[in-house]
């Protein structure tokens, strides 16, 4: 059977009026996985994002991360898009530097 | 194949409202994002907003704030767009589009004419 | 409110010849938002180019597009009789999202 990920944004300061926003997908098997950010829907090109490589995570599931860096004040126009076993959904920048959890069910 | 299907040509009077649908197939409903763009006669394109149907967020153009609403209805897969307090410069095609994975509107709904007469 | 200039506001041509279409923007657009359409009589738009120089789905080789910045060109290297069209630019790069008031190609 399938585990659907678990997915958590998380933004960080990166230079003076721009942030850094990652999103991580963790727990999640069979390792096929689509993790990529969205500006007003529309995904981002690859040379905008940088993504992590989808590895295991001990437990006979995998982890992997997509980040991109966007000016403040833009967020709410950011969404991280997750794909995976049919399954999809989006998950938006946290404000402040809270976390946003979302476990994709089935 | 992938269409978005609108509700058919209105007829309103100024101070009325109305509401216009779009039903997308040939895809999952909630994993792009709707646009709404209008068009008024003989003129070029105007954005009105966006709403992302998976977790709801709406962003609108500043000019639509106040008379424009979108909403979805996931259980028919059906997205909508009502306009208020219309006059007779909102005589329009108002359109429905698709977010892509690589431009803001690859597929397009038909058009729907709204006419504002008294 | 990035303002998308497109010129000429018409150009007469005949089938077999060359069409070379401009979009000005206001402001900067990196080329990953600059996207162009295609729109025939009582047609809906249809997404023709996409970042600037990528041929949508279905899209014939003929059309180009190129440029960066703030100045953008789509380019018909051989104009065919379904080519006959209303073109706009649009940028997804800032709100709100904007096109250009179009550029109608008609036969001379």
């Known amino acids: 059977g399938s585990v659907p990920p678990m997915v958590n944004v998380t933004r960080s300061e990166a230079s003076e009026g721009n942030i850094t926003v990652t999103c991580r997908a963790s727990s999640f098997y069979p390792r096929n996985i689509t993790l990529t950010w969205r500006q007003d829907g529309v995904s981002l090109s690859h040379d905008t994002q940088q993504w992590g490589d989808v590895l295991p995570d001990g437990n006979g599931t995998y982890q992997t991360w997509v980040a991109t860096r966007i000016c403040q004040g833009e967020e709410q126009r950011f969404t991280c898009y997750m794909e995976h076993s049919g399954n999809h959904s989006t998950h938006p920048v946290p404000s402040g530097n809270s976390h946003h959890h979302h476990h994709h069910h089935h | 194949e992938i269409q978005l299907v609108q509700s058919g040509a209105e007829v309103k009077k100024p101070g009325a409202s109305v509401k216009v649908s779009c039903k997308p197939s040939g895809y999952a409903f909630t994993s792009n994002n709707i646009y709404w763009v209008r068009q008024a006669p003989g003129q070029g394109l105007e954005w009105i907003g966006y709403?992302?149907?998976?977790?709801?967020?709406?962003i609108y153009n500043q000019q639509f704030k106040d008379r424009a609403t979108l909403t979805v209805d996931k259980s028919t897969s059906t997205a909508y767009l009502e306009l208020s307090s219309l006059r007779s410069e909102d005589t329009a095609v108002y359109y429905c589009s698709r977010s892509g994975e690589r431009s803001n509107f690859d597929y397009w709904g038909q058009g729907t004419l709204v006419t504002v007469s008294s | 409110e990035i303002v998308l200039t497109q010129s000429p506001a018409t150009l007469s041509l005949s089938p077999g010849e060359r069409a070379t279409l401009s979009c000005s923007a206001s402001s900067s657009i990196s080329s990953n938002y600059l996207h162009w359409y295609q729109q025939k009589p009582g047609q809906a738009p249809r997404l023709l180019i996409y970042r600037t120089s990528n041929l949508a789905s279905g899209i014939p080789a003929r059309f180009s597009g190129s440029g960066s910045g703030t100045d953008f060109t789509l380019t018909i290297s051989s104009l065919e009789p379904e080519d006959f069209a209303v073109y706009y630019c649009?940028?997804?790069?800032?709100?709100?999202?904007?096109f250009g008031q179009g550029t109608k190609v008609e036969i001379k």
């Open positions: 709403i992302d149907p998976y977790i709801g967020r709406i």
């Open positions: 649009q940028q997804g790069g800032s709100l709100p999202l904007t």
